[in-house]
């Protein structure tokens, strides 16, 4: 029950996280015009990964896409790549984790297969979250660097008289959405990995097996049960049996086609 809850919660948290990463990637407000200590202008500039926008006080908003690929800064391209990789990995992870959910039965899929799929999706979520966090952090670092550079430029001019107001940019809402979403995806991935451990069948003979010996009808019980039977250490009439007899749902998990995603 705890495993199912952990897996389910991990899935939901990752789903929210990936939705957030997609939202952050699409948002226009990665960087916004810094209004602090600036002359009050009637336009508000903000930029995203794909386009830059200007909102005028009169109510008009104009957005222009970055139609060039080669002319864009390498850092921006890197951030785009990280976010897209994060989304792709997250989407594949979600797809895998849906089939891995314990509460969903698909054919005669074994628990070992589900465990492997849960682990795979968990790793994908972790990498997806890290990609998003890395992408947002790289962009934030770029902003901080540019901010201080433009601040220095603001106060250097001919005779100290500033003729052009340098537009400085600060952190936009998308950065915070990205950080939170990346964190959630990461947490979701960790939860999936934890759930995987609980799903994986262990190599212990916990099931009582009935073995009919010739001549006598003796019920053999595996020794693994002795601690919980109430018979103490009285094992005189018991024989630890480790033969090939197994119950139906304790089939040895050999590598199968379901194990590899």
């Amino acid at each position: 029950m705890a495993v199912t809850a952990c897996q389910g919660l991990g899935f939901v948290v990752s789903l929210i996280g990936i939705a957030g990463i997609i939202a952050a990637t699409c948002m226009d407000q990665w960087s916004t015009q810094d209004l602090y200590n600036n002359p009050v202008t009637a336009v508000f500039n903000y930029q995203g990964l794909w386009r830059s926008c200007v909102r005028e006080s009169s109510g008009f908003t104009e957005c222009r896409g970055y139609f060039t690929l080669l002319g864009l800064p390498a850092m921006l391209q890197a951030v785009r790549a990280l976010m897209i990789v994060g989304i792709v990995l997250g989407a594949i992870g979600l797809l895998v984790s849906i089939f891995a959910l314990k509460c969903i039965r698909i054919g005669s899929m074994e628990d070992s297969a589900k465990a492997n799929m849960t682990l795979t999706s968990g790793i994908m979520f972790i990498v997806s979250g890290l990609c998003a966090i890395a992408g947002v952090s790289v962009f934030a670092n770029m902003l901080v660097t540019n901010f201080w550079m433009s601040t220095a430029n603001m106060y250097t001019g001919m005779g100290g008289m500033v003729q052009t107001v340098q537009t400085r940019y600060t952190f936009g809402a998308a950065l915070f959405v990205g950080w939170v979403a990346g964190g959630l995806t990461l947490i979701g991935g960790v939860m999936m990995c934890i759930a995987c451990r609980g799903l994986a069948p262990e190599e212990t003979n916990y099931k009582a097996v009935s073995y009919h010996a010739s001549g006598h009808s003796v019920a053999y019980k595996p020794g693994g049960f002795k601690a919980s039977t109430g018979f103490g250490s009285n094992t005189k009439n018991k024989k630890i049996y480790d033969g090939g007899a197994r119950t139906e749902d304790e089939v040895q998990s050999y590598p199968s086609k379901h194990d590899y995603v």
């Epitope: 009637a42 005028e56 006080s57 009169s58 109510g59 104009e62 003729q163 107001v165």
Partner: antibody, heavy 117, light 113 residues
Framework: QVQLKESGPGLVAPSETLSITCTVS????????VQWVRQPPGKGLEWLGA???????NYNSALMSRLTISKDNSKSQVSLKMSSVTAADTAIYYC???????????WGQGTLVTVSS | DIVMTQSPSSLAVSLGERVTMNCKSS????????????LTWYQQKPGQPPKLLIY???TRESGVPDRFTGSGSGTDFTLTISSVQAEDLAVYYC?????????FGSGTKLEIK
């Protein structure tokens, strides 16, 4: 079509409060801003202030302490209030709709306000 | 506040003549975000409210004849009338639409010789 019409008292006594209403049609005040401009007789244009779609306002720094611009979206009305008027406030008062580039693309005909005792 | 300086204060021209008037702002009106200059030109005829001619320094308002051309960037701007017509006789104002409070130039009066 877009229309703006100013309605004012015509005559205001010195030190009184001047109140002008701008009634708009053909556009919504929740989408576009309205700006106020005045023109003393035989002189140039002076920007007074503006109220934008979101309700935020900006004022002429020299008149800020005396000016209040407000609006009623449901009535499609914008009002300008100027306290402690003097003869120097005698002018034609215009309201205008904000357009591209924060420019004023549609103007009212203006209302002449004379400050005199 | 931004100071808008217009020159000349008045000019007398013959019909069909090309005319140029200038406007200078105390700070750059260029917005780096969209590379547009927030300078507007208005025309005011006697007894009428001002009429929008040009916004973003060079974009003609719809319905404005193409003989009116706005140019310039940063702090220096120009309004050109390629061939003056009788109906162009008016006062022309430039306005800063970038920094609050918005400010007007003192105007250029266009008269017939």
């Amino acid at each position: 079509q877009v229309q703006l019409k100013e309605s004012g008292p015509g005559l205001v006594a010195p030190s009184e409060t001047l109140s002008i209403t701008c009634t708009v049609s053909g556009f919504s005040l929740t989408t576009y801003g309205v700006q106020w401009v005045r023109q003393p007789p035989g002189k140039g244009l002076e920007w007074l202030g503006a109220i934008w779609a979101g309700g935020n306002t900006n004022y002429n720094s020299a008149l800020m302490s005396r000016l209040t611009i407000s609006k009623d979206n449901s009535k499609s009305q914008v009002s300008l209030k100027m306290s402690s008027v003097t003869a120097a406030d005698t002018a034609i008062y215009y309201c205008a709709k904000g357009g591209y580039g924060n420019a004023m693309d549609y103007w009212g005909q203006g209302t002449l306000v004379t400050v005199s005792s | 506040d931004i100071v808008m300086t217009q020159s000349p204060s008045s000019l007398a021209v013959s019909l069909g003549e090309r005319v140029t008037m200038n406007c200078k702002s105390s700070q750059s009106l260029l917005n780096s975000g969209n590379q547009k200059n927030y300078l507007t030109w208005y025309q005011q005829k006697p007894g009428q409210p001002p009429k929008l001619l040009i916004y973003w320094a060079s974009t003609r308002e719809s319905g404005v004849p193409d003989r009116f051309t706005g140019s310039g960037s940063g702090t220096d701007f120009t309004l050109t009338i390629s061939s003056v017509q009788a109906e162009d006789l008016a006062v022309y104002y430039c306005q800063n639409d970038y920094f609050f409070p918005f400010t007007f130039g003192s105007g250029t009066k266009l008269e017939i010789k």
